[in-house]
Interface confidence: low
């Protein structure tokens, strides 16, 4: 009901954990020397650590990561015609996260 | 087995849909005139549209949004002692998404 909109619920902290994020597959991951092609798909889902910790001296960091190769299509444009090739991109998924102390930044001298 | 890691599965497109994201509650959302306080929690989960579309002329955009008020704690520091107050922040959740045409930028003349 509309009435339920009126109650401001207590805000819950977004805890430090893995969440699904979108990762854009940039062309330079496939081929740094040539930009005359397209990549399909242009983006994929990855698991990444996010959220916040109890104080500003700690940050949500991955404690375990896994590399995951995926196959994409590299669509080269040659004389205005598409040529379909395959390429492999390695994605990084975060498997576990932890609030870890951040090393204090050195003062700029 | 380790051998299974060598197989590159076909990459699946991260479709345009709502996903859980982390939203940082900045102090200026609570009080623009005074910075001498902390906010708890520092971040919350929101639903946001993300993902990619079939071509670069369309973008994943929210078609329906909802404002959601939540109550946070404003911890003011007065004479080095914390004073706990309540404040309300309005979060915006995306409820539905669509790949929408991006208006072409006019050429710079």
């Amino acid at each position: 009901s509309l009435g339920s909109l009126t109650v401001a619920e207590p805000a819950m902290i977004a805890e430090c954990k893995t969440r699904t994020e979108v990762f854009e597959i940039s062309r330079r991951l496939i081929d740094r020397t040539n930009a005359n092609f397209l990549v399909w798909p242009p983006c994929v889902e990855v698991q990444r650590c996010s959220g916040c910790c109890n104080n500003r001296n700690v940050q949500c960091r991955p404690t375990q990561v896994q590399l995951r190769p995926v196959q994409v299509r590299k669509i080269e444009i040659v004389r205005k015609k598409p040529i379909f090739k395959k390429a492999t991109v390695t994605l990084e998924d975060h498997l576990a996260c932890k609030c870890e102390t951040v090393a204090a930044a050195r003062p700029v001298t | 087995s380790l051998g299974s890691l060598t197989v590159a599965e076909p990459a699946m497109i991260a479709e345009c849909k709502t996903r859980t994201e982390v939203f940082e509650i900045s102090r200026r959302l609570i009080d623009r005139t005074n910075a001498n306080f902390l906010v708890w929690p520092p971040c919350v989960e929101v639903q946001r549209c993300s993902g990619c579309c079939n071509n670069r002329n369309v973008q994943c955009r929210p078609t329906q949004v909802q404002l959601r008020p939540v109550q946070v704690r404003k911890i003011e520091i007065v004479r080095k002692k914390p004073i706990f107050k309540k404040a309300t922040v309005t979060l915006e959740d995306h409820l539905a998404c669509k790949c929408e045409t991006v208006a072409a930028a006019r050429p710079v003349t």
Epitope: A8 | L29, P62, L67, T90, H94
Partner: antibody, heavy 120, light 107 residues
Framework: EVQLVESGGGLVQPGGSLRLSCAAS????????MSWVRQAPGKGLEWVST????????SYADSVKGRFTISRDNSKNTLYLQMNSLRAEDTAVYSC?????????????WGQGTLVTVSS | DIQMTQSPSSLSASVGDRVTITCRAS??????LNWYQQKPGKAPKLLIY???SLQSGVPSRFSGSGSGTDFTLTISSLQPEDFATYYC?????????FGGGTKVEIK
């Protein structure tokens, strides 16, 4: 000093199109949500549309949804309102307004407005 | 949509008078209520946000109160420059809506 200057208004026939611009200065444009609000002659204020700081989120009044498009170019400090399929009831002074913090739907600063007249 | 109803639609008052304008929301909007002042031919100016917070630079004779559905704008001692039209606006949920306005005229 915050300054918002609208342009692009004028006389247009029903069914026609106009593109309004709002040039912003005196504040960090890319950090603020922006809105369009209109006022028909002798009438009250009516919210038209709001766009987020990065341009990724937009919201529209039902009366303009599907006909008007709000957009922004943060590199030019400019807000736009593309108005299509204009109707006589769209006749109003259109003002852009700076909409406060990231989730503030209020209007801190306003431009003087630009008059849009829809008539045959 | 949330309807905002302002009363009165107009009033006549003298310099020095205490003026009260009310705004009622069709459903609870917590404290998401803002007040604006508009003079003829000029852009509106934000006076009060979040029901009772005075916008920077606004004279302290202006005050706001209320929460839920009923809100009040009070001018403690009307000054010549205060003759204008006043609008309330809810910023609780889109579509954002304004009250119909209250015109404060010289008696």
């Amino acid at each position: 000093e915050v300054q918002l200057v609208e342009s692009g208004g004028g006389l247009v026939q029903p069914g026609g199109s106009l593109r309004l611009s709002c040039a912003a200065s005196g504040f960090t444009f890319s950090s603020y949500w922006m809105s369009w609000v209109r006022q028909a002659p002798g009438k009250g204020l009516e919210w038209v549309s709001t766009i987020s700081d990065g341009g990724g989120t937009t919201s529209y009044a039902d009366s303009v949804k599907g006909r008007f498009t709000i957009s922004r170019d943060n590199s030019k400090n400019t807000l736009y309102l593309q108005m299509n399929s204009l109707r006589a009831e769209d006749t109003a002074v259109y003002s852009c307004a700076e909409s406060g913090g990231a989730t503030d739907y209020l209007f801190d600063y306003w431009g003087q407005g630009t008059l849009v007249t829809v008539s045959s | 949509d949330i309807q905002m109803t302002q009363s009165p639609s107009s009033l006549s008052a003298s310099v020095g008078d205490r003026v009260t304008i009310t705004c009622r929301a069709s459903q609870s909007i917590s404290s998401y209520l803002n007040w604006y002042q508009q003079k003829p031919g000029k852009a509106p100016k934000l006076l009060i946000y979040a029901a009772s917070s005075l916008q920077s630079g606004v004279p302290s004779r202006f005050s706001g109160s209320g929460s839920g559905t009923d809100f009040t704008l009070t001018i403690s001692s009307l000054q010549p420059e205060d003759f204008a039209t006043y609008y309330c606006q809810q910023s609780y949920i889109t579509p954002l809506t304004f009250g119909g306005g209250t015109k404060v005229e010289i008696k």
